[in-house]
């Protein structure tokens, strides 16, 4: 037997993070987003739950609704109406997938202190939002879309086909909301509230998976969710717009899918409003290296939109799927015709492009070895937009303006040299025309949010400061952070490295990798964390390193479209050839060397452990998915193409973790799902467990009753946490 | 419900200081600014001043070398005094609430009272 | 300081027309423009506020629009209670300023 190490940070008054501090979110900072109402207004929820109007020019602040109404309805959340004569109070929040949830509306008038009373909105709402004028009210309720002229008023019925898990109608279902729209909604009110756009998903073909959920009941409930898995059939989708001013006169009308699109399976995108009467769709093909941009116009004439072809602008990939994890969207000029969009230019680095006419036209505004990464807001002289180019470092952000107006345009850093140490990693948040914002800075120092002049750039005001949090780090002693890249033959991998306090070269250190590793992700930013694996550096003496690999986003398309058609073998290698370069720079300990992930991690955890190398003694995957016929279609085919003879299906089945069971033999390994995974099913984790006991291979694991994908509720957490750190200190000898 | 009530003496003898208050109910005053406004005999509305919820204020460039607006938030209550009057200040004065949620438009309005300057 | 200009000053309409009365500002204000109703020996009403909003318990007949420089009140159908004069404000900057008032009276 091993004797066991214990680390013990030397002589020092600061005490070492515990594993108590990180469950109970002792040190989680805030951040502070303005809810911008006008060009120099903007709302706030108050520490107390007051909503606070704030004018920056008056200085002046307001409380227009106070806790006690929030409270008198157990609101969390709350949303003024563009008059801002009405708010809506959002209570009874249920969480459903990663975005979606249903909750409780009341409406509160503002000008008379009371609530509205007739007419009162049903209940749960799956959906519900102000027109951008005025108070009218646009909902969804059981899978249809109803809609009130004011909030008094009875409401109208826009939509007839909404049913449960077959049609939906204005929100999306759960592919959609996952793997493409990433939001809980599905409808667009024009500029001017005058139509709504919305899409109806049909998923009545789609196959359903299938759990139980145990709850407290003598039977489990089955949850049915349609789930359309690599392979199978999707969703059918189409758009529609309605005029809200007449919705009894003249029924929705359907936008036409652009032909080149139509001509096989395809997915809607996104819905982008360009003026009161314009609208843009982006429509993209099964295989997802083809996406098509359509701008279509409302004829008056008759009563329906229009798509001329020669509004169609196609965007494709010749080396991998279009776009990012997502394809971007347009920010379109003051003209209504011509916008900014970012896509690879033809070194393959994502860059903004102008387009007036055709994409063949387009012209380029950014270049470089770096990339553009989203464009915040473009007003009739500037566009401000994040990218990672200074310095050189992918995982840092910082954000832009161009000076459209000149000619040339100019380019300026607004945050490159605002707060250098402490600040390298910013997003943003605009007024409507850019007059005033906001920047949030994630670190790597303590987060800060700042109020800024959009004219000069001027700071205004400190929103967040973090004050407390800094107070309470102060007697902590935190690790050091690293980040670094480093080479391998023509590669070059970039990593961080999280060394424990008083760390000293000339020891042998335990290390663990931490990875997620999926296409287009990065894992290696300049932001702050206080976390499991800050404590396993502090208080355990454990390296941490997350490196990343082939796949991985923001360092343009040869490295982002390796993994192309071949998941689970790039990232993987890349990890490997990290932990190789790390044991050469001498403080490693090779014999106690293990990899941890989640979700796309636990399944690169997985197969870095099957490697066969060695190189590991143990490792944990969480959530792992375990071959890509069992993830959501939208996802699998972006990166993996079918899983038909004709296609891929040869690596969709040599791809599995279940193919490499026996080469978990001479490994530790820790599997962890919850049992209520609606994103990666549980189906996963039962697979390789099967494999591993059909192979007859020892492992330990760890399911979670009811837990979904995050496995976050305060208990299971809890849980999980501790026993991951039991398994990695008992794997490392260290002891308890 | 929301009220804005003046109270003064409804003659002021020329150069003295004209003093008027404001007395507010039904209605938060961190919600909302107050304005004085005024309206000679016959004629149009003018605005003299606002002092807003923080207490800062903000006065008519034409007059503003003689007008003072102040706040009693304990009293609910709102003064306005303005100095070396002439007979071109007499008008119904109005106290007035406006705030954000009507874009500070004026949206509650007092029933103003007389004030005549004579000797 | 902004000057509103408001025309007319004064019309005369019968019951069930519809009046519209404009006004003009010196300065773009966007559209940070009331409208009032003061009836005689009353103090002022807001109707409209941002140049379209209607203000609440303000019948429908009654509407704004506008922006920039260029503003209209309009009664789509007048109503004997309606007999007033209507003044139109900026609430844009400090000083805020009135248009010099439009009476409307009955034929």
């Known amino acids: 037997l091993r004797p066991s190490r214990v680390y013990k940070p030397e002589g020092n008054t600061k005490r070492a993070l515990t594993l108590k501090d990180i469950l109970n979110g002792t040190f989680s900072y805030k951040t502070y987003f303005p809810n911008w109402i006008s060009e120099q207004e903007y709302l706030h929820q108050s520490e107390d739950d007051n909503i606070v109007f704030y004018n920056i020019e008056t200085r002046e602040s307001y409380i227009i609704l106070s806790n006690s109404t929030m409270k008198s309805v157990n609101a969390t959340d709350y949303g003024l109406s563009p008059d801002r004569q009405f708010v809506y109070l959002e209570s009874d929040y249920s969480k459903l997938w990663r975005y979606s949830y249903t909750a409780t509306y009341y409406i509160y008038d503002l000008q008379n202190g009371e609530f509205v009373r007739g007419y009162e909105l049903p209940r749960p709402i799956q959906y519900l939002c102000w027109s951008p004028v005025g108070s009218k009210l646009a909902y969804v309720y059981q899978n249809n879309i109803y809609l009130k002229q004011r909030p008094g008023d009875p409401p109208f019925q826009i939509t007839y086909t909404g049913r449960e898990n077959r049609i939906f109608n204005g929100i999306p279902d759960w592919v959609y909301e996952e793997e493409m729209l990433a939001t809980k909604y599905a409808l667009w009110w024009s500029p001017d509230g005058k139509f709504l756009a919305y899409v109806e998903f049909n998923d009545s073909d789609i196959p359903i998976i299938a759990y139980s959920y145990y709850g407290d009941g003598q039977y489990p409930r089955t949850i049915n969710i349609p789930y359309p898995k690599a392979g199978a059939k999707n969703p059918v989708v189409r758009v529609f717009i309605v005029d809200t001013t007449y919705p009894h006169h003249v029924g929705p009308m359907e936008v036409p899918v652009p032909e080149m699109i139509a001509s096989s399976d395809y997915y809607f995108s996104w819905l982008t409003w360009v003026s009161s009467e314009r609208v843009c769709l982006q429509w993209l093909k099964r295989v997802q290296n083809v996406s098509v941009l359509s701008i279509c116009d409302f004829r008056e004439d008759w009563h329906a939109w229009e798509c001329p072809k020669n509004q169609e602008h196609v965007e494709e990939s010749r080396t991998g799927w279009a776009g990012g994890f997502f394809v971007s969207t347009p920010a379109f000029s003051q003209d209504a015709t011509s916008y900014y969009k970012i896509f690879s230019d033809k070194d393959g680095y994502k860059h903004i492009h102008y387009i007036k006419d055709t994409v063949e036209n387009a012209i380029q505004i950014t270049s470089g070895k770096w990339e553009a990464i989203y464009i915040f807001r473009v007003t009739q002289d500037s566009l401000f937009y994040s990218s990672n180019e200074f310095e050189g470092y992918p995982g840092r952000r910082n954000i832009y303006r161009i000076s459209i107006g000149n000619s040339p345009p100019s380019k300026k850093c607004v945050t490159c040299h605002l707060r250098k140490e402490r600040c390298q990693y910013y997003t943003a948040s605009f007024s409507y025309k850019a007059k005033y914002y906001a920047l949030v800075c994630y670190g790597p120092g303590l987060p800060i949010s700042t109020l800024h002049d959009g004219r000069t750039d001027q700071e205004i005001q400190v929103l967040e400061e973090n004050k407390e949090l800094e107070n309470s780090l102060r007697n902590i002693q935190l690790p050091k952070v690293e980040i670094k890249k480093l080479k391998d033959g023509g590669l070059t991998f970039w990593y961080k490295m999280i060394l424990p306090p008083q760390f000293d070269r000339s020891k042998k250190y335990p290390l663990l990798i931490q990875v997620y590793g999926g296409p287009c992700s990065q894992s290696v930013k300049s932001v702050f964390a206080v976390n499991w694996i800050t404590y396993l550096a502090s208080k355990e003496g454990i390296v941490i390193a997350l490196v990343d690999g082939r796949g991985t986003a923001f360092q343009g398309d040869k490295f982002l479209h390796a993994v192309y058609r071949k998941l689970g073998v790039y990232e993987v290698e890349d990890q490997l050839t990290a932990v190789r370069k790390f044991i050469e720079m001498g403080f490693i300990d090779e014999e106690r060397i293990a990899i941890w992930g989640w979700s796309y991690g636990g399944y690169v955890s997985s197969l870095a452990l099957a490697s066969g190398t060695g190189l590991f003694k143990c490792g944990i995957a969480v959530a792992p998915v375990s071959s890509w016929e069992y993830y959501a279609s939208i996802y699998s085919e972006r990166f993996m193409g079918l899983p038909t003879k004709d296609d891929n299906l040869e690596h969709y089945k040599n791809s599995t973790v279940m193919a490499r069971a026996e080469y978990f033999r001479n490994v530790d390994y820790l599997l962890i799902h919850g049992t209520a995974d609606d994103n990666v099913h549980f189906q996963n984790s039962a697979q390789i467990a099967k494999a591993l006991v059909n192979a007859q291979v020892d492992f330990q694991a760890m399911w979670y009753s009811d837990q979904n994908h995050g496995i976050s509720s305060g208990r299971s957490q809890n849980h999980l946490y501790t026993h991951m750190t039991h398994f990695l200190k008992q794997c490392f000898s260290l002891s308890d | 419900q929301v009220q804005l009530q003046e109270s003064g003496p409804g003659l002021v003898k020329p150069s003295e200081t004209l003093s008027l208050t404001c007395t507010v109910s039904?209605?938060?005053?961190?919600?909302?600014?107050i304005n004085w406004i005024r309206q000679p005999p016959g004629k149009g509305l003018e605005w003299i001043g606002l002092?807003?919820?923080?207490?800062?204020?903000n006065y008519n460039p034409s007059l503003k070398s003689r007008v003072t607006i102040s706040k009693d938030t304990s009293k609910n209550q709102f003064s306005l005094k303005l100095s070396s009057v002439t007979a071109a200040d007499t008008a119904v004065y109005y106290c007035?609430?406006?705030?954000?949620?009507?874009?500070?438009?004026?949206?509650?309005w007092g029933q103003g009272t007389l004030v005549t300057v004579s000797s | 300081d902004i000057q509103m200009t408001q025309s007319p000053s004064s019309l005369s309409a019968s019951v069930g027309d519809r009046v519209t009365i404009t006004c003009k500002a010196s300065?773009?204000?966007?559209?940070?423009v009331a409208w009032y109703q003061q009836k005689p020996g009353k103090a002022p009403k807001l109707l409209i506020y941002?140049?379209?909003y209607r203000y609440t318990g303000v019948p429908s007949r009654f509407s704004g629009s506008g922006s920039g420089t260029d503003f209209t009140f309009t009664i789509s159908s007048l109503q004997p209670e309606d007999i007033a004069t209507y003044y139109c404000?900026?609430?844009?900057?400090?000083?805020?300023?009135f248009g010099g008032g439009t009476k409307v009276e009955i034929k």
């Open positions: 007035v609430r406006g705030g954000p949620l009507v874009w500070y438009a004026l949206d509650y």
């Open positions: 002092i807003w919820t923080g207490g800062g204020t």
């Open positions: 941002s140049a379209s």
């Open positions: 039904g209605f938060s005053l961190t919600n909302y600014d």
């Open positions: 404000q900026q609430h844009y900057s400090n000083p805020r300023t």
């Open positions: 300065q773009d204000v966007s559209t940070a």
